[in-house]
């Protein structure tokens, strides 16, 4: 909400399934930035009020997050800097199912795209040979 | 620096609906909660709701549930809250403030609510 | 509902001297995770929005005078200020942002003595 005269950037996302009860990974790539500082980094939810997750400035700013997620989600903020904005989601559950969004903006500019993520049940089919 | 601005008083009958206003101007940020709090005549701080304007989540205090309709069109990056079956009790400044903690406040506006 | 009680109602401090605002909540706003506590001070004065001063129940909202402290966890809050000046005075609230509904509590007013 609000202006900027920033140009857009390439985020790129992968859709995904987690296992309930499991970690599970929400792909987000983007162009990186050569200053962690500059990277904001912001992950949302259809239906949900507050953020999922952000992460700015080098670290995690949690006050804006959504009671539904706090304490179950981390980014891999050493591979920040290489343009890796996926987030880590612990303890997967039913209801973490729907649209996502990782929303980047950087000294270059902004960009965001939409993550499907399903969860359920899944294993891994037995090959028999 | 992120300012909201929101719209004029304004005057009602008991029984009718006010739309209320609020846009954004001068941050980057297209993903903060945008809330609406008011408070009646030397009264305290109440939240009414807030709206995701990225995806148009809307979630609403219990209290207001069937009464408040909060909506945001991010094209024009203004929120609107609106109020339905107005009652006197409902004259009130109506803030608008981004984020779950409010760092940016609306100016306010001034529902009164009189046969 | 969480429900946020502040106390006292109102207070009257002289120029120079501490005032000392308490807030108590009906259930620990503490996330013992990362052990931070969602309660935030807001300063109103009349004819004017509210203003964050203080979030995570002690950290300064960058701007605020240093003369404004938080402190408190779990369910009591302290929002002290060291030496009021003249334009302190104002309505102060305190918020919980622990889980929604955001609730307040009813404020406190602060006059001068």
């Known amino acids: 909400f609000g202006i900027s005269g920033r140009h857009s950037i390439t985020v790129t996302t992968v859709a995904s399934a987690g296992n309930i009860g499991e970690d599970g990974i929400l792909s987000c790539t983007f162009e990186p930035d050569i200053k962690l500082s500059d990277i904001v980094i912001q992950w949302l939810k259809e239906g949900v009020l507050g953020l999922v997750h952000e992460f700015k400035e080098g670290k995690d700013e949690l006050s804006e997050q959504d009671e539904m997620f706090r304490g179950r989600t981390a980014v891999f903020a050493d591979q920040v800097i290489v343009g890796n904005a996926s987030l880590r989601l612990k303890n997967v559950q039913l209801t973490d199912a729907g649209t996502y969004k990782c929303y980047i903006i950087t000294s270059k500019g902004k960009g965001n795209a939409n993550l499907e993520y399903k969860t359920g049940a899944f294993s891994m089919p037995e090959v028999n040979v | 620096q992120v300012q909201l601005v929101q719209s004029g008083a304004e005057v009602k009958k008991p029984g009718s609906s006010v739309k209320v206003s609020c846009k954004a101007s001068?941050?980057?940020?297209?993903?903060?909660?945008i809330n609406w709090v008011r408070q009646a005549p030397g009264q305290g701080l109440e939240w009414m709701g807030g709206?995701?304007?990225?995806?148009?989540?809307?979630r609403y205090a219990q209290k207001f549930q069937g009464r408040v309709t909060i909506t945001a069109d991010e094209s024009t990056s203004t929120a609107y809250m609106e109020l339905s079956s107005l009652r006197s009790e409902d004259t009130a400044v109506y803030y608008c403030?981004?984020?779950?903690?409010?760092?940016?406040w609306g100016q306010g506006t001034l529902v009164t609510v009189s046969s | 509902d969480i429900v946020m009680t502040q106390s006292p109602d109102s207070l009257a401090v002289s120029l120079g001297e501490r005032a000392t605002i308490n807030c108590k909540s009906s259930?620990?706003?503490?996330?013992?995770?990362?052990?931070?506590?969602?309660l935030a001070w807001y300063q109103q004065k009349p004819g004017q929005p509210p203003k964050l001063l203080i979030y995570?129940?002690?950290t300064r909202e960058s701007g605020v005078p240093d003369r404004f402290s938080g402190s408190g966890s779990g369910t009591d809050f302290t929002l002290t200020i060291s030496s009021l000046q003249a334009e302190d005075v104002a309505v102060y609230y305190c918020?919980?942002?622990?889980?929604?509904?955001?609730?307040f509590g009813q404020g406190t007013r602060l006059e001068i003595k």
């Open positions: 403030a981004r984020g779950r903690l409010h760092r940016h």
């Open positions: 001068g941050g980057t940020f297209s993903t903060y909660a």
């Open positions: 709206i995701n304007p990225m995806f148009g989540t809307a």
């Open positions: 259930q620990s706003v503490l996330y013992s995770s990362n052990n931070k506590n969602y």
């Open positions: 995570w129940a002690s």
């Open positions: 918020q919980q942002y622990y889980t929604t509904p955001i609730t």
